[in-house]
Each structure stands twice: as C-alpha cells, then as structure tokens.
C-alpha cells in the first residue's frame, strides 16, 4: 500500500491534521524533499552572519560572514574573526606570529618556516611573519630546467577553538 504522503512534493508537508493532504509550507519554513511530515524552520542569518541565499519553500537560507570574519564549520556554522597576514587568532585576539613562524592568510595559525638545511638547500630568501623562507636549489640541482624554489610548508587547520 502506497504511503499517501509520498505524493507530497518539496515545498509542502503531509498534514496529519487534514487527512494526510499535502499542505504548503508556511512562510519562513521549507521542505527540501518530498514526503515530509513537517516543514523545517528557515535558518536566520543574523548578527555577524549575512544572508548569502534567501530561504524559499524548498531550500534553507545560506549564510556567510560579514566583512572582517570568515566561515568555519559545515554550512558556515560559525564566523571567526579575520586577522592580518603575519598574525594568528588567539583567545586574546589577533597576535603577531612568533619569530620563526609565518601565516600568509587572514585565517589559520602561524606555521614554522621551512628548514632549508634539512633538505640540504641554502636559504634563497629569508622568511617573515607573513611569508615562508624560500629555499634555493641544492648545489647539485643547478642544472638547466631545474626548479629553483621549494614549495612552502603545507597548511594546517587552526588548533584552537573559534571565539
């Protein structure tokens, strides 16, 4: 026996109070799939969140963050403060990277400079708070067509909780 609710399309719900007929989702709610017995309340993008896509009867609102903040988490569940390049976000706010570390983005943590000597390479360009060290080629690598720079260290995810 077919469930009568399976005929209810997205944007509606199967109304048990009305003999399982399909009723439209009311304003500020949605159902993104057919056959739903309730409509979900739309997400409200308030405060530091900004509306990227409005809610409709068939899809939830999508939020991003106001300028000076960036999204964290699935579906932008949190907004975290931006810092300048050369800084990282701590519990006390944005702090400059310690000597020997760098951050070339507005988010994330400071990462150690690449250690050129571990790869047997000379330092071609010193690192700064906002830029990694650039390693030169190994003396034996100075052949035509060889790459003369080492890619920067891989990025790590922030290791602290968002404010």
């Amino acid at each position: 026996l077919q469930d009568p609710c399976s005929n209810c399309p997205a944007g509606t719900f199967c109304d048990n109070n009305r003999n399982q007929i399909c009723s439209p989702c009311p304003p500020n709610s949605f159902s993104s799939a057919g056959g739903q017995r309730t409509c979900d309340i739309c997400r409200q993008c308030k405060g530091v969140f900004r509306t990227r896509k409005e809610c409709s009867s068939t899809s939830n609102a999508e939020c991003d963050c106001t300028p000076g903040f960036h999204c964290l988490g699935a579906g932008c569940s949190m907004c975290e403060q931006d810092c300048k390049q050369g800084q990282e976000l701590t519990k006390k706010g944005c702090k400059d990277c310690c000597f020997g570390t760098f951050n070339d983005q507005k988010r994330g943590i400071c990462r150690p400079w690449t250690n050129c000597s571990l790869a047997g390479k000379p330092v071609l360009m010193n690192g700064t708070k906002a830029r990694d060290v650039v390693c030169g080629p190994r003396p034996a690598d100075l052949s035509p067509g060889a790459s003369s720079v080492t890619p920067p260290a891989p990025a790590r995810e922030p290791g602290h909780s968002p404010q």
Partner: antibody
C-alpha cells in the same frame, strides 16, 4: 514574460466580483504573486500574496473581504462583498524569485473596479 | 502588523537638485526594503531592492540606504522625468504577524 489583470468593471455593493491575473512566459510554481490596489488619488495597498508553493497570506485588514486563489496560469482575487471603499485599480505583480522575502519586479497595468449603487 | 511610515508626503525641488525620502518601519526588517516609482496611469516600477541594490536598468542617480527600521531614498541630479510618486515596501515575509509586504504612504516628487 507578462502579467495581465482582467475582470474589473462597475458592480453594485454586495455583488461578488472575481479578478483574474493571467501570466505568460513563466511558471507560477516558481514565483510568488501579490495583489495590490490603489484607490483614486491614493497610495498603494497590499492585499495578499500567493507563494510559489501555493501558500496564501492576506494582509490583516482583509479579514475575509478578499479571497486569493491560484491555477497553473492564473491567480484570482475575489472581492467577496464589495463596498464603495473597494473602488480602486487592482494590480497583480510577480516576485523576482521564489524566496519568502522577495520583491516584485513585474507588474500588470491594473484593472479598474468601480463599486457604486 | 508592520507599518511603513514615509516622509515627507510631498517634496518640490529644481532640476539638478537632490531629493531625500525617508521610510520608517514599525519593527526591524533588516534590509528587506524595496523602493518603487509610480507615474500617473502606470503601474509601480521597481527601483531598489534589499534597501540599496539598484534594479536592472535604473539610473545610478537613485540611491537607497539604511537597515533595521530607518531607510532613505536619495535622488540626485534631478531630472524632469523623475517627477512621480515614490513608495517604500517591506518584503520581510516573516514578521511575527506574517504580514510583510506593506507599503509606505508615498511621497510625491515635484520637479520645478
């Protein structure tokens, strides 16, 4: 894409009247439609809306004086028991998108309803 | 219900001048506000939506601003073709009263 109102005429008080908004070039299952009226020399007054999913909402002041309906290509507005205060040009308009908080960017030319004994 | 209060009811300005129209909502509507222009015998024409975004084909002389409960429409370098009545409208669907498409009372702009 267009919307066109029809059905406006001279009616006597208490005689029900149904206005029709006929759309072409787009689907009513994608857009919301509103009814708005304008009495001679007065401002715009929102009557009600029918959303893409069929949900209908009336302005609070309507209190049963108007009934909105929808088919696949038309939106209806019934003036259930017209009074002389309902004399106005009635407009229907299409939303810009299918969201709940939408705005209206495609308007018909309006249809004139005159209620007089 | 959300009530939209528009001021002034009428304003007169010379060609080349600037006109400012204000619209106040009885409760916060975020940036869910549209402005329309209406000339006699014509339907309203959308000018601005989301409080400050210019509708397609509308001159940049029209500028909308504000959020929450206070909104402004500014028309600069006024032209004779700008003579019309201007309306604000909330498009905040989901107020506590589920009554979110109210218009302001209108402002007649007279261009000298």
């Amino acid at each position: 894409q267009s919307v066109e109102e029809s059905g406006g005429r001279l009616v006597t008080p208490g005689t029900p009247l149904t206005l029709t908004c006929t759309v072409s070039g787009f689907s009513l299952s994608t857009y919301a439609m509103i009814w708005v009226r304008q009495a001679p020399g007065k401002g715009l007054e929102w009557i009600g809306v029918v959303y893409d999913n069929g949900y209908i909402s009336h302005a609070t002041w309507v209190k049963g004086r108007f009934t909105i309906s929808k088919t696949s290509t038309t939106v209806g507005l019934e003036i259930t028991s017209p009074t002389t205060e309902d004399t106005a040009t009635y407009f229907c308009a299409r939303s810009a998108d299918g969201s709940w908080s939408t705005y209206f960017n495609l308007w018909g030319q309006g249809t004139l309803v005159t209620v007089s004994s | 219900d959300i009530v939209m209060t528009q001021t002034p009811a009428s304003v007169e300005a010379a060609v080349g001048g600037t006109v400012t129209i204000k619209c106040q909502a009885s409760e916060s509507i975020s940036n869910y506000l549209a402005w329309y222009q209406q000339k006699p015998g014509q339907p309203p024409k959308l000018l601005i939506y989301k409080a400050s975004t210019l509708a397609s084909g509308v001159s940049s002389r029209f500028k909308g601003s504000g959020s929450g409960t206070e909104f402004t429409l500014t028309i600069s370098d006024l032209e004779s073709a700008d003579a019309a009545t201007y309306y604000c409208q909330t498009n905040y669907c989901c107020s506590s009263s589920d009554n979110g498409f109210a218009f302001g009372g209108g402002t007649e702009v007279v261009v000298k």
